[in-house]
Amino acid sequence: PEPPTACREKQYLINSQCCSLCQPGQKLVSDCTEFTETECLPCGESEFLDTWNRETHCHQHKYCDPNLGLRVQQKGTSETDTICTCEEGWHCTSEACESCVLHRSCSPGFGVKQIATGVSDTICEPCPVGFFSNVSSAFEKCHPWTSCETKDLVVQQAGTNKTDVVCGPQDRLRA
């Protein structure tokens, strides 16, 4: 068996004392001594600390600046920061979500593989053979070419990744 080699998990060493850290939501006012306990104070309005700590100042809640397209997704508490997200049609430029950009549209020839969210951009994919997209859109998937046969028609003009096939009546003289 070995003797102890450190303070316990929620403690810190100061002046030979293992003092309790302050709980999340509280900041350090004074270290413990042989006769006194660690003194902690709750964080103020619009402040937080999210870990056991010995910080003398709480952190300010993040500000979701509407001028940058941001809005509050989750209001901060004394133990958690505010979480920002982007307005409809926009997404965050980084994980920290400090600013927003407009969702990207998929050009003709490309369809939406995954619709954008507040934190991720639109994911586009090229329309494969048999599919097309003739619009620039943040929502539209690639559409399948029209099946002329099911309408008792024939292909008059082949489809591309940007255009649908053109169907026409069957040539009766070929009967």
Epitope: P1, P3, P4, R8, E9, L13, C18, Q23, T38
Partner: antibody, heavy 125, light 107 residues
Framework: QVQLVQSGAEVKKPGASVKVSCKAS????????MYWLRQAPGQGLEWMGW????????NYAQKFQGRVTMTRDTSISTAFMELSRLRSDDTAVYYC??????????????????WGQGTTVTVSS | DIQMTQSPSSLSASVGDRVTITCRAG??????LNWYQQNPGKAPKVLIH???SLPSGVPSRFSGSGSGTDFSLTISSLQPEDFGTYFC?????????FGGGTKVELK
Amino acid sequence: QVQLVQSGAEVKKPGASVKVSCKASGYTFPGYYMYWLRQAPGQGLEWMGWINPDSGDTNYAQKFQGRVTMTRDTSISTAFMELSRLRSDDTAVYYCAREKPRYFDSFYYYLMDVWGQGTTVTVSS
Amino acid sequence: DIQMTQSPSSLSASVGDRVTITCRAGQNISRHLNWYQQNPGKAPKVLIHPASSLPSGVPSRFSGSGSGTDFSLTISSLQPEDFGTYFCQQSYSTPPTFGGGTKVELK
């Protein structure tokens, strides 16, 4: 000031269980381990185990394994010790005590700096 | 578990006497030793830690010494409030273990 206040005396029959509480005040309850000890009449002190009030992790003395359960409720800063299958030789004063690690002359050591007033448990048929 | 042996188990003394209690550890515990005082019907309280350090507020008539396996607690001039039981405790390893106690009675 720092205080540990224990529940009142108990009289139990052999085979029964007893649950003793220890309410902490004056310090950050989850920040320090809580020890439970007992002292039989006219005897020395015997360590039963500890609980980490933050995580709920426990470490029981081998002698009490399977019979003792230590729990806590951080919302009311209270630790609990339950001893089951009581026998007459479990008659003792049960104490909770806060573990206070210190650092001195290049090494760490643990001591029990604050104690509850003790809870007398009598096991008798 | 580390066995702690305390002697004597009891002693009778008068106010003003010099009293020494010894404690022996079953293995080397360096200086990881605490002394506790217990008055009748009360919980123990820390007297000396580790081995020789006197917490503030404990009268200077108390002193501790030793390291390794042999330790002692000395009261240079016994006072009326000093009568009670004294325990040594090793904090070198888990489980912490105590000596059997020394009861200091009035002669």
